[in-house]
């Protein structure tokens, strides 16, 4: 469905302003911050969500070893520039004319520079590793059950096609979810792994982006799965370009 017609809200993005001013009096929703129209039948892009967040009033061994090129979002929040499709622009700058290049999930992938910095293309993040630690339980979860429920979650809540959930690894209490999506695999209408990972991250933090839905309540055979920490690693189709100074710091 698009924006809920009865009370004109956006089920997939509560950081919107909605009104019945679309064609034929249909409900149309615009993202806070950017004012861009959003499709409420699917996830909103991370760029528009970050922009909306910055505009809102401030108020919180079988396991995979991330590769040497994996990025972690250490820079935190910033007010991004989004293109007309809602994607991150390859080059981001702050108010003091400090610029840097980002990948498709908005994570910095170069050293910071000045306005002369060039970012030729938006490099796609094709592999995301979500590393979770769950709270202690009476016993370990069954790996197959955990895999089934996490796949169901990404499929049902985030509408991510199962083929993009490459693997679910488990060594109690660590769970790793691998999302993979090459440019060639992503068809029109497919949810982007970066957007799904961002919605999941916000859900885990108890900051759900969905309108009116309860927070994330994940259970495996009736046993609550409560996450106590999350780390997300991003791998790009082209390795990031940082100076040796950063790498040895």
């Amino acid at each position: 469905h698009t924006a809920a017609q009865d009370n004109c809200t956006c089920p997939t993005n509560k950081m919107t302003v909605c009104s019945p001013d679309g064609p034929g009096g249909r409900c149309q929703c615009r993202a806070l911050g950017s004012g861009m129209a959003v499709d409420c039948s699917t996830l909103t892009s991370k760029c528009l969500l970050l922009k909306a967040r910055m505009s809102a009033p401030k108020n919180a061994r079988t396991l995979v070893r991330p590769s040497e090129h994996a990025l972690v979002d250490n820079d935190g929040l910033y007010d991004p520039d989004c293109d007309p499709e809602g994607r991150f622009k390859a080059r981001q700058c702050n108010q003091t004319s400090v610029c840097w290049c980002v990948n498709s999930v908005g994570v910095r992938r170069t050293d910071k520079g000045d306005l002369s910095l060039r970012c030729d293309e938006l490099v796609r993040t094709h592999h995301i590793l979500i590393d979770l630690r769950h709270r202690p339980t009476a016993g370990a979860f069954n790996h197959s059950d955990l895999d089934a429920e996490l796949r169901r979650l990404f499929r049902e809540r985030y509408r991510l096609h199962p083929k993009f959930v490459a693997a679910v690894h488990y060594e109690q209490p660590t769970i790793q979810i691998e999302l993979r999506q090459n440019t060639s695999q992503k068809a029109a209408g497919d949810v982007d792994i970066g957007d799904a990972a961002y919605y999941f991250e916000r859900d885990i933090k108890g900051e759900s982006l969905f309108q009116g839905r309860g927070g994330l309540d994940l259970r495996v055979r009736g046993e609550p799965l409560q996450v106590e920490r999350t780390l997300i690693y991003y791998l790009d189709e082209i390795p990031p370009k940082f100076s040796m100074k950063r790498l040895t710091a």
Partner: antibody, heavy 117, light 111 residues
Framework: QVQLQESGPGLVKPSQTLKLTCTVS?????????WNWIRQPPGKGLEWIGY???????LYNPSLKSRVTISRDTSKNQFSLKLSSVTAADTAVYYC??????????WGQGTLVTVSS | DIRMTQSPSSLSASVGDRVTITCRAS??????????LHWYQQKPGKAPKLLIY???NLESGVPSRFSGSGSGTDFTLTISSLQPEDFATYYC?????????FGQGTKLEIK
């Protein structure tokens, strides 16, 4: 022992709304799992209609989504199916079933609903 | 939607026979850990009964003469030695993708 029992009218007129209820005993529907409706037209195969989860989330078969609502009453440990604008093609045995981790381990005995004027 | 195709549609066999039913999915229903393919038995006028879950796991209380195998798109249900109570219709079901879908069924009859 988990048990599911369907109830509701056996005859519905065309264009009306079919309403069925599944009463669950032996397990609280808000404690876990996914609570499904599945149907089987006479002499035919099985068709998944949709579910309501332990937390109240819904998922429906896109082929029926515009006509289906699955809701629950946790105080009675029941979940219900509403199918609007029915036609003769909706004549079927309707089953409720529990989805454990994406397979159906417990089923109701089924109830035949005939759509006819 | 994932299309599930069972073969044969019907099968005549005798008590004591070894019987194999196959189920083919229109796309893979496996993950790195799981095979989201399940088998059910249905007798006339009764609800389906779970036999095998995740391709090869025998549901509690189901006789060991039933077994399942396969991965990806091709799966098999085997009954090692048919018993009189096994004459029924068998369905496969995938749960890798929404909507969940079932095979058209295989009717197992007495020869």
């Amino acid at each position: 022992q988990v048990q599911l029992q369907e109830s509701g009218p056996g005859l519905v007129k065309p264009s009306q709304t079919l309403k069925l209820t599944c009463t669950v005993s032996g397990y609280s529907i808000s404690s876990g799992y996914y609570w499904n409706w599945i149907r089987q037209p006479p002499g035919k195969g099985l068709e998944w209609i949709g579910y309501i989860s332990y937390s109240g989330r819904n998922l429906y078969n896109p082929s029926l989504k515009s006509r289906v609502t699955i809701s629950r009453d946790t105080s009675k440990n029941q979940f219900s199916l509403k199918l609007s604008s029915v036609t003769a093609a909706d004549t079927a045995v309707y089953y409720c079933a529990r989805d454990t981790t994406a397979y159906f381990d417990y089923w109701g005995q089924g109830t035949l609903v005939t759509v006819s004027s | 939607d994932i299309r599930m195709t069972q073969s044969p549609s019907s099968l005549s066999a005798s008590v004591g026979d070894r019987v194999t039913i196959t189920c083919r999915a229109s796309e893979s229903v496996s993950s790195s850990v799981n095979r989201f393919l399940h088998w059910y038995q249905q007798k006339p006028g009764k609800a389906p009964k779970l036999l095998i879950y995740r391709a090869s796991n025998l549901e509690s209380g189901v006789p060991s003469r039933f077994s399942g195998s396969g991965s990806g798109t091709d799966f098999t249900l085997t009954i090692s030695s048919l018993q009189p109570e096994d004459f029924a219709t068998y369905y496969c079901q995938q749960s890798n993708e929404d909507p969940y879908t079932f095979g058209q069924g295989t009717k197992l009859e007495i020869k």
